[in-house]
């Protein structure tokens, strides 16, 4: 056959679907690889062809669109399973072609099983709720396009293994789950089971997401530098190791980039001709407030180094702060025979 632009296996789109549930999978060509949509392609006389390679096989085979009850079908640029079976797992290819043009891409599809607590190998999206922030909602994800708006599905919500009913601060409201006020105790996995009829059959869609309760923006403050501070003086003799920690607290801020850095005499440490190393550690509170510590280390400090200015800087979406460390050269302890004797007026 003629040459085909092969985009290979698109592992960025590791699609996971539950066994025995409907799945609608759009051909990735139109979403990520080509600059035109399916309608344009179809109007131009291009045909979309689907085929697959079973798990642990090398042989590409056509997809059987003649299964009972049209279990697998194609509609425009969407491949439909109504429903999936475990052995549908494999690599699927969609190819767009006519006599003069050809483009194709493959993607992995994994059909997974779940247990009655909705545990599975499925990678879960994370939804962050602000702590004690007032009413917030999560919405049952990825159910668009499965049924028309005229269909009124039933939706049941679960937290972990338990159906949500009579929860103090969590109220199911159809596709939404409302948190009247979110607490740390609301952290966990939430599942919606959407049940709908289609052509005399009944289907379930199961969607699980992880809720993480995080610091509220109303409590957010600019970065706080705990160290260095005015109470600690770094007094060293030449030849000793100088270790100065910069410890900064960052309030949780959605999509904020938290940064900590040192300057020495107003320059980045890399731009100073001294042997300096910086090690960073990061810890998080239960509400994802962040504490970053950067330890500046000079193995064998010189008297010149002890005269330099060491400043810790921090920046978040809330602002920028800086704090200088107090670094001194240690005054040598007096030698008794000379200094003390002189001090006591000995002759």
């Amino acid at each position: 056959s003629e040459r085909c632009d092969d985009w290979g296996l698109d592992t960025m789109r590791q699609i996971q679907v539950f066994e025995d549930e409907p799945a609608r999978i759009k051909c990735p060509l139109f979403e990520h690889f080509l600059k035109f949509n399916y309608s344009t392609a179809h109007s131009a006389g291009l045909t979309l062809i689907w085929y697959w390679t079973r798990q642990d096989r090398d042989l590409e085979e056509p997809i059987n669109f003649r299964l009972p009850e049209n279990r697998i079908s194609k509609e425009k640029d969407v491949l439909w399973f109504r429903p999936t079976l475990l052995n549908d797992t494999g690599n699927y290819t969609c190819m767009l072609r006519n006599t003069t043009y050809c483009s194709k891409v493959a993607f992995p599809l994994e059909v997974v099983q779940k247990d009655s607590c909705f545990n599975s190998p499925m990678k879960l999206p994370v939804h962050k709720l602000y702590i004690e922030y007032g009413i917030q909602r999560i919405t049952c994800p990825n159910v668009d396009g499965y049924f028309p708006s005229s269909v009124k599905p039933t939706i049941t919500w679960y937290m972990g293994c338990y159906k949500i009913q009579n929860f103090n601060n969590v109220i199911p409201e159809g596709m939404n789950l409302s948190f009247l006020i979110a607490f740390i105790s609301n952290n966990g996995n939430y599942t919606c089971v959407v049940t709908y009829p289609e052509n005399g059959r009944t289907f379930h869609l199961t969607r699980t997401l992880t809720v993480k309760v995080v610091g509220s923006p109303k409590n957010a403050v600019p970065p706080v530098i705990h160290s260095p501070n005015d109470h600690v003086v770094y007094e060293k003799e030449p030849g000793e190791e100088l270790l100065i920690p910069c410890t900064v607290y960052f309030s949780f801020l959605m999509d904020s980039r938290n940064e900590v850095w040192w300057t020495i005499d107003g320059k980045k440490p890399d731009d100073i001709p001294i042997d300096v190393t910086i090690n960073e550690s990061i810890s998080h509170s239960r509400t994802e407030d962040e504490t970053r510590t950067q330890i500046l280390s000079i193995k064998k400090v010189t008297s010149e180094d002890l005269k330099r200015s060491y400043v810790c800087h921090a920046r978040s979406a809330k602002g920028e702060v800086a704090k200088a460390a107090t670094v001194k050269q240690k005054v040598p302890a007096p030698r008794y025979t000379v200094e003390l004797a002189c001090g006591f007026g000995a002759t």
Epitope: Q113, K114, D115, S116, C117, N119, K152, P153, T154, T156, C161, Y162, Q165, N166, V193, V194, T195, T202, H204, T206
Partner: antibody
């Protein structure tokens, strides 16, 4: 094909216990909850409780809390309902039912338990 | 516990008749009501879930409606195989509860 096959009819004395089994086949047992519902002769349906086979957690109708125990054995794909301190009013057909997303789509054939002295 | 009051408790009808059975909940149960059909000596069979959705394979002559506290099961044209007992049940909150049943008999 999904099937729930229950144990046979039982005749019990007042004060004794009965344990009814429900063997599941045709699906992955620990993917669904199993509920128990009973029906006294000529009466309506009465929900007794359910078991989540993954967590082992069971929830009971308070009316039966002190007398009913619902369990599941994942190794044999079998659910059990044990009712103790039986009285004549417990004479009923006991059903197990598979539930997912609030749908009681599959039921066992029922087990008649007769309590008589 | 939420009480489900079903009426009538029995009715006589002929093949082809339109039959309506109602169920009233003592509290708001949203749309979380199911209807079951039961024939003598058999286990219940799911007909309607979510107040108005027909379960797989259920003929279109069966329909459900209602929300909150008032629910209805309608058989548009009664067939010989429809003579049975019908139960409503709320699947909203534990303990789940059922109506007393409506026996549909041949007139």
């Amino acid at each position: 094909e999904v099937q729930l096959v229950q144990s046979g009819a039982e005749v019990k004395k007042p004060g004794s216990s009965v344990k009814v089994s429900c063997k599941a086949s045709g699906y992955t047992f620990n993917s669904y909850w199993i509920h128990w519902v009973r029906q006294a002769p000529g009466q309506g349906l009465e929900w007794m409780g359910y078991n989540n086979p993954t967590s082992g957690y069971s929830e009971y109708n308070q009316k039966f809390t002190d007398r009913v125990t619902i369990t599941a054995d994942k190794s044999t794909s079998t659910a059990y309902m044990e009712l103790s301190s039986l009285r004549s009013e417990d004479t009923a057909v006991y059903y197990c039912a598979r539930e997912y997303g609030d749908l009681f789509a599959y039921w066992g054939q029922g087990t008649l338990v007769t309590v008589s002295s | 516990a939420i009480q489900m009051t079903q009426s009538p408790s029995s009715l006589s009808a002929s093949v082809g008749d339109r039959v309506t059975i109602t169920c009233k909940a003592s509290e708001n149960v949203g749309y979380s009501v199911s209807w079951f059909q039961q024939k003598p000596g058999k286990s219940p069979k799911l007909l309607i879930y979510g107040a108005s959705n027909r379960y797989t394979g259920v003929p279109s002559r069966f329909s459900g409606s209602g929300s909150a506290t008032d629910f209805t099961l309608t058989i548009s044209s009664l067939q010989p195989e429809d003579f049975a007992t019908y139960h409503c049940g709320q699947i909203y909150i534990y303990p789940y509860t059922f109506g007393g049943g409506t026996k549909v008999e041949i007139k």
